[in-house]
Amino acid sequence: SSCGQVKCRKGEQCVHTASGPRCFCPSPRDCESGCASSPCQHGGSCHPQRQPPYYSCQCAPPFSGSRCELYTAPPSTPPATCLSQYCADKARDGVCDEACNSHACQWDGGDCSLTMENPWANCSSPLPCWDYINNQCDELCNTVECLFDNFECQGNSKTCKYDKYCADHFKDNHCDQGCNSEECGWDGLDCAADQPENLAEGTLVIVVLMPPEQLLQDARSFLRALGTLLHTNLRIKRDSQGELMVYPYYGEKSAAMKKQRMTRRSLPGEQEQEVAGSKVFLEIDNRQCVQDSDHCFKNTDAAAALLASHAIQGTLSYPLVSVVSESLTPERTQ
């Protein structure tokens, strides 16, 4: 119904009030629900109302505002501290101890986070985003610096329908359209061979407890697994001679092991040259990601931090030991 300059929606009536014409909903079930657009954020509950905007939000603390969009810091919450002597003793021994796997304890001194003590260091959200990995979207954490809220704002994240088939045919130089989707890793870019690469700045340097020959043999699965976590595509970097940058890694024994070594006589060359795993240099190719998503990594810093976040959660399917983001072209180092 028309109400002067004001246009009322279906089911609403025009009421002339002292402050001018207003729309009013006499029976909410006959009107478009303001809740239809899910306006209440951060888990707030929506209640239909008779007056515009036809909803009200009941916010869950610590949020407020008409759409629960405002974060209100609890009054003087003391910063969490890692009080336990137990954790001080266990930190940086190369083993992740769940009792110390907290932000306050630097994720067991980096033992639970691929040696990265603060993956959220660049996250300026008022929320402690590490505590909001909760299978629901928290927009205040949905930034690259806050690791895209662990990709929890992607709507219902789909799973790859033909996962086994797509895994077997990933990056095999043959385009399988049934696998050419974000959730299936864009078929390892098999369907985008004619498109120009779109490389993120920097290099991911990962240490994984698999010898080079085994890692290279399993490279497609390895790249697919990490690409799935990062929602983009990865490839092994090549050096100036065109060789894949996968090198034997001899291990950096932890402080615990160094201490142990000093207490007994080592045999000549004992375990010194034994290959513990591989050091692999990876690049991110966003050529498909940028077409389907606005959650792509422009550089490898946040990608490294997201892998560390997955390590904290225990959701890595490969024995990664450390991850570093290198901005410059790396020398071949062990």
Epitope: E98, G251, K253, Q260, G277, G314, P319
Partner: antibody
Framework: EVQLVESGGGLVQPGGSLRLSCAAS????????MSWVRQAPGKGLEWVSY????????YYADSVKGRFTISADTSKNTAYLQMNSLRAEDTAVYYC???????????????WGQGTLVTVSS | DIQMTQSPSSLSASVGDRVTITCRAS??????LAWYQQKPGKAPKLLIY???TRESGVPSRFSGSGSGTDFTLTISSLQPEDFATYYC?????????FGQGTKVEIK
């Protein structure tokens, strides 16, 4: 097939020493933590010690700290438990068991050896 | 150390019965709890980890639930091969401690 085989058990006098071995096969030995768990005759299970072969980090139960030493030889895919100053209460079947979660001590033990009996008696 | 208290310590049941074993931790262990089955003269076998995830190859009649301090192992329909001793174990904090065990016997 992932397999753990213990050896080295036997009869020893109180105050004596014994070294148990646990030979692992069928998986990447360096990648997974290993624990020793014991069971006294007719009793329940008791966790004894843990090692992460990659970093060499070790953990012990208070009841064995200072007397037992866990170690690993990654070239032989074998974990060891060196037991010194043995007491009658150390009599038990000793099992080695692999942790399921790579570098996480906070993971369940998914593969167990058959056990080796250690008897401490005069 | 975290104490784990299992109950009952033993129970008698018949084939086809529904059996429930409980385990209580002396402090919050989140969901870092495993259940093991052990038969006489054999090594323990992992049934459940993460409080409720069945280990691969374990029959669906075994289920686990709980978080924090209170946990349950349920065998929905007891089979002849299920007569054994069951242990819970917390792996949240070292030393990892076991419950004292529950022996499931034939009635």
């Amino acid at each position: 097939e992932v397999q753990l085989v213990e050896s080295g058990g036997g009869l020893v006098q109180p105050g004596g020493s014994l070294r148990l071995s646990c030979a692992a096969s069928g998986y990447s030995f360096t990648s997974y933590g290993m624990s020793w768990v014991r069971q006294a005759p007719g009793k329940g299970l008791e966790w004894v010690s843990y090692i992460y072969p990659y970093s060499g980090a070790t953990y012990y139960a208070d009841s064995v700290k200072g007397r037992f030493t866990i170690s690993a030889d990654t070239s032989k895919n074998t974990a060891y438990l060196q037991m010194n100053s043995l007491r009658a209460e150390d009599t038990a079947v000793y099992y080695c068991a692999r942790h399921s979660g790579y570098y996480r001590i906070s993971s369940a033990m998914d593969v167990w050896g058959q056990g080796t009996l250690v008897t401490v008696s005069s | 150390d975290i104490q784990m208290t299992q109950s009952p310590s033993s129970l008698s049941a018949s084939v086809g019965d529904r059996v429930t074993i409980t385990c209580r931790a002396s402090q919050n262990i989140k969901r870092f709890l495993a259940w093991y089955q052990q038969k006489p003269g054999k090594a323990p076998k992992l049934l459940i980890y993460g409080a409720s995830t069945r280990e691969s190859g374990v029959p669906s009649r075994f289920s686990g639930s709980g978080s924090g301090t209170d946990f349950t192992l349920t065998i929905s329909s007891l089979q002849p091969e299920d007569f054994a001793t069951y242990y819970c174990q917390q792996y949240y904090r070292s030393p990892h401690t076991f419950g004292q065990g529950t022996k499931v016997e034939i009635k």
